[in-house]
């Protein structure tokens, strides 16, 4: 997931004028930018964030929003603060009219503005079976650990904090911060206003259909009684969470948004920052058949979004939408019909659907697995999820076919037992957002803080590509494909695994050109070879076949196109070992398939050749796909054949470090 | 009607900065890659920069580090930022446009004089 | 880099004759390779790309060839508004994009 896509509109106003004779005026060129929703019914005008550059203190925070008030009443205009942010993000919400909007952008300190917009609940017993491992029987649902060690914050409407399902399980705290209901013949009806939210609470940990039923729960309303928030009341609640994190340390923290409006850049940020505080978030991918990436906080990378499936695992139907999917969603868990407390009585129950449902199963499981391992990271968590989920059982058929490459085929489920999956070597698939169609137009794939990039591949619809490279970028490595003139666009998968006291480089060989191919290998000590990437300047590869793949003796080698530059990823790490498999078809084949077996686990997907008609090459799960042009295009022609190239790798520290434990 | 309008261009020192600047008509700009060309007094034509509109960048090797390109998309406007100037600096510098159906650059602008000289 | 010769320097000829300019990668560039005319005092304005396909507003007379390290530009009979230089450009390695130093194309 990553903050670069979506119909997001973003208008920028340069800070040119030193008007108002500023104290403190920005650098020359440097430019602060306005945002709105790109869907226009969800734009909340005349409320407005104002985002402050990183290292603004509240002192200075509070004295822009008084600098704002000061020239806008020179204006004959009225302002008003109405939060000053500090804790998740420096800022301040003021509501005011757009004529202001230049003369805000000019501040000193202002990173930039956000028109304030709307959220909504995503919602419109199969569901334990499905997350339960087969050796439980849903009527016995007994999970190892309830939770009882994690706190679940969840920002919804209010709840029934005395139903039965939940009652001493959720603590309701003071915060409220939600908009006016809409109509004016609207009627608050407590078991309507609080719907949503007790049926979530429940289903995260309720005594008889919760998932997590030893996990405390803190709710905070941020949704009003029709489901509808605003994008700086879910902030403050975010800031609120941060604080009371602050003041009150406990355990591990889960919080669940199961709500979603429109792409936002400053929500995404709220969520990134609570995010590496340690907190882990879960949000609903949204409910509009969709890209999830168009919405915010689904977008967030890191954020654990979700969608939703039913008990045929069947991506959900809601009315003529459905549950989102791309690649900003990490899994789907179940969120149809879902039985769960309801509002109406004490005892009463009642089914709803939705990715807020989904969401609210990931994170009642993500609570047991923190109680069973507290000191899991966010990163070992999501691999976690992903890896204990249930693989390609979803049907792709659903989603639209540009996206089926790009959705998770997962299903979350509960680890057969909460222990000992430490030995295992976590690596997950993260594409990036699509590069756009002109030739210099490039697409970044990034990983997570704690994981390490040990393969990096591109795949194009068109074939026309110029390969990928990993590069360094702000202390990390990231994975970078490339366009080509004539391509509709690229995309970059990095694979990005979990791999303590990792030691990793890129080496590179220029292209062989005189040669029959470049190749490169790991020649430092102790280094293994985890994936090979290709990049090429010219635009057209020519049919050049490389030679014998890799000269025995010398696995830890990459080859490729005379014309191209070759990457490998060397690693070094306890105990890490890894192989190459490779799978070649001498006939045209549309795809061509590597595994890795048992107790190994796929770090690096290559294609060879790397010539034209290869569309490229990207993991699913432990497998390695290598995409080519239909094969009526091809042709039987030698040039036709391909060889898809899979690095397995395992780790006998970590087992060794797990049979200790055990 | 296309059109793109180059600024900036003047007479500056060596070890001076300058900042050029290119704004846009009749084309949605973010749309379109866009480069700089330069061309010093009776020479040929030479590739400076180019951006993508996402803001993928790329570079000639002689101005790699000193020259920066970047775009403003919502305000149809392209920038490049030169510092650590040189006398081999000098020329008319262009901006140009290149379409995902043709290749090569399709529009050129007037282009602004560079001149580096103490 | 991909380094791009011009042959001739100069070429003179006389209105209503044929022109014939050259140009040379020093590798292939398949075909990507495109042509530009420029008048003094004026920007390059593009001519052919893809070595042989003529861009808008340019008449049947241009036309080009070639493909590999070799390619031709012809002029069938030049007009006096044809007298300008005519530069070559390669597309298929980058960056950078390289250009050819020109043919001045003046009377006879």
């Known amino acids: 997931q990553e903050d670069e896509d979506g119909d997001y509109e973003e208008l920028v106003l340069a800070l040119r004028s030193e008007e108002d004779g500023l104290a403190e005026a920005p650098e020359h060129g440097t430019t602060a930018t306005f945002h709105r929703c790109a869907k226009d019914p969800w734009r909340l005008p005349g409320t407005y964030v104002v985002v402050l550059k990183e290292e603004t203190h509240l002192s200075q925070s509070e004295r822009t929003a008084r600098r704002l008030q000061a020239q806008a009443a020179r204006r004959g205009y009225l302002t008003k603060i109405l939060h000053v942010f500090h804790g998740l993000l420096p800022g301040f919400l003021v509501k005011m009219s757009g004529d202001l909007l230049e003369l805000a952008l000019k501040l000193p300190h202002v990173d930039y503005i956000e028109e304030d917009s709307s959220v909504f609940a995503q919602s419109i017993p199969w569901n334990l079976e499905r997350i339960t491992p087969p050796r439980y029987r849903a009527d016995e649902y007994q999970p190892p650990d309830g939770g009882s060690l994690v706190e679940v914050y969840l920002l919804d409407t209010s709840i029934q904090s005395d139903h039965r399902e939940i009652e001493g399980r959720v603590m309701v705290t003071d915060f409220e911060n939600v908009p006016e209901e809409d109509g004016t013949r609207f009627h608050r009806q407590a078991s309507k206003c609080d719907s949503h939210g007790t049926h979530l609470a429940g289903v995260v940990s309720g005594r008889d259909a919760g998932v997590a039923k030893g996990a405390s729960m803190r709710s905070l309303r941020v949704l009003n009684c029709q489901g509808k928030g605003t994008v700086s009341g879910t902030l403050i609640g975010l800031e609120f969470i941060r604080k009371s994190q602050l003041v009150q340390p406990v355990g591990p923290l889960v919080v669940l948004l199961p709500l979603a409006g429109g792409y936002s850049r400053v929500l995404n940020a709220a969520c990134q920052r609570l995010a590496r505080a340690g907190v882990v978030l879960v949000t609903a991918a949204g409910n509009f058949r969709d890209d999830a990436c168009l919405y915010s906080p689904a977008s967030a990378p890191e954020v654990i979004t979700v969608g939703a499936t039913n008990a045929q695992d069947q991506p959900v139907t809601l009315g003529t939408l459905g549950t989102n999917f791309g690649r900003c969603v990490d899994l789907f868990a179940p969120g149809e019909d879902i039985i769960g407390a309801s509002s109406d009585c004490s005892t009463c129950f009642v089914s709803q659907s939705g990715t807020s449902q989904a969401a609210a199963h990931v994170a009642g499981i993500a609570a047991m697995m923190l109680s069973a391992e507290p000191e899991l990271t966010l990163a070992e968590l999501r691999q976690r999820l992903i890896h204990f989920s249930a693989k390609d059982v979803i049907n792709e058929a659903w989603f639209p076919e540009d996206q089926r490459v790009l959705t998770p085929n997962l299903v979350a489920a509960l680890p057969p037992s909460t222990h000992g999956a430490g030995w295992q070597l976590f690596c997950r698939t993260v594409w990036s957002a699509h590069s756009g169609p002109t030739r210099m137009a490039t697409a970044v794939a990034r990983c997570a803080p704690d994981e390490e990039l040990l393969s990096c591949s591109s795949f194009s619809r068109s074939g026309k590509r110029r390969g990928e490279r990993m590069e360094a970028q702000g202390g990390k490595l990231v994975c970078r494909a490339h366009n080509a003139f004539g391509g509709e666009g690229v995309y970059a998968i990095a694979r990005c695994c979990l791999l303590p006291q990792a030691n990793c480089s890129v080496h590179t060989a220029p292209p062989a050109e005189a040669s029959m191919g470049t190749r490169v290998h790991c020649h430092q000590q102790g280094h293994v070879l985890t994936g090979c990437s290709s990049h090429w300047e010219v635009e057209d590869l020519g049919t050049h076949k490389p030679p014998v793949l890799r000269p025995r003796g010398q696995p830890n080698q990459c080859v490729g196109h005379r014309e191209a530059s070759i990457h490998a990823s060397c690693c070094h790490a306890p105990g890490l070992e890894c192989k190459v498999k490779e799978h070649g078809i001498p006939a045209p084949q549309e795809q061509v398939t590597v595994a890795c077996e048992e107790g190994w686990t796929l770090t690096g997907c290559s294609a060879l050749p790397g010539t034209s008609h290869v569309l490229g090459a990207y993991a699913v799960d432990n497998t390695c796909v290598v995409r080519s042009r239909d094969v009526s295009t091809t042709g039987s022609t030698s040039e036709g054949a391909v060889t898809a190239v899979a690095i397995c790798c395992r780790s006998r520290h970590l087992a060794q470090a797990s049979q200790e434990l055990q | 009607e296309v059109q793109l309008v180059e600024s900036g261009g003047g007479l500056v020192q060596p070890g001076g900065s300058l900042r050029l600047s290119c704004v846009v008509s009749?084309?949605?700009?973010?749309?379109?890659?866009m480069h700089w060309v330069r061309q010093a007094t009776g020479r040929g034509l030479e590739w400076v920069s180019g951006?993508?509109?996402?803001?993928?960048?790329s570079y000639t090797g002689s101005v790699k580090g000193r020259f920066t390109i970047s775009r403003e998309n919502a305000k149809n406007s392209l920038h490049l930022q030169m510092n650590s100037l040189t006398t081999g600096d000098t020329a008319i510098y262009y901006c140009a446009r290149e379409d995902i159906a043709v290749p090569g650059f399709d529009y050129w602008g007037q282009g602004t004089l560079v001149t580096v000289s103490s | 880099e991909i380094v791009m010769t011009q042959s001739p320097a100069t070429l003179s000829v006389s209105p209503g004759e044929r022109g014939t300019l050259s140009c040379r990668a020093s590798?292939?560039?398949?075909?990507?390779l495109a042509w530009y005319q420029q008048k003094p005092g004026q920007a390059p304005r593009l001519l052919i790309y893809g070595a042989s396909t003529r861009a808008t507003g340019f008449p049947a007379r241009f036309s080009g060839s070639g493909s590999g390290t070799e390619f031709t530009l012809t002029i069938s009979s030049l007009q006096s508004e044809d007298f300008a230089v005519y530069y070559c450009?390669?597309?298929?390695?980058?960056?950078?994009?390289?250009f050819g130093p020109g043919t001045k194309v003046d009377f006879k």
């Open positions: 009749g084309f949605t700009f973010g749309d379109y890659d």
């Open positions: 951006i993508a509109p996402a803001g993928d960048t």
């Open positions: 450009q390669q597309y298929n390695k980058w960056p950078p994009f390289t």
């Open positions: 590798q292939s560039v398949s075909s990507n």
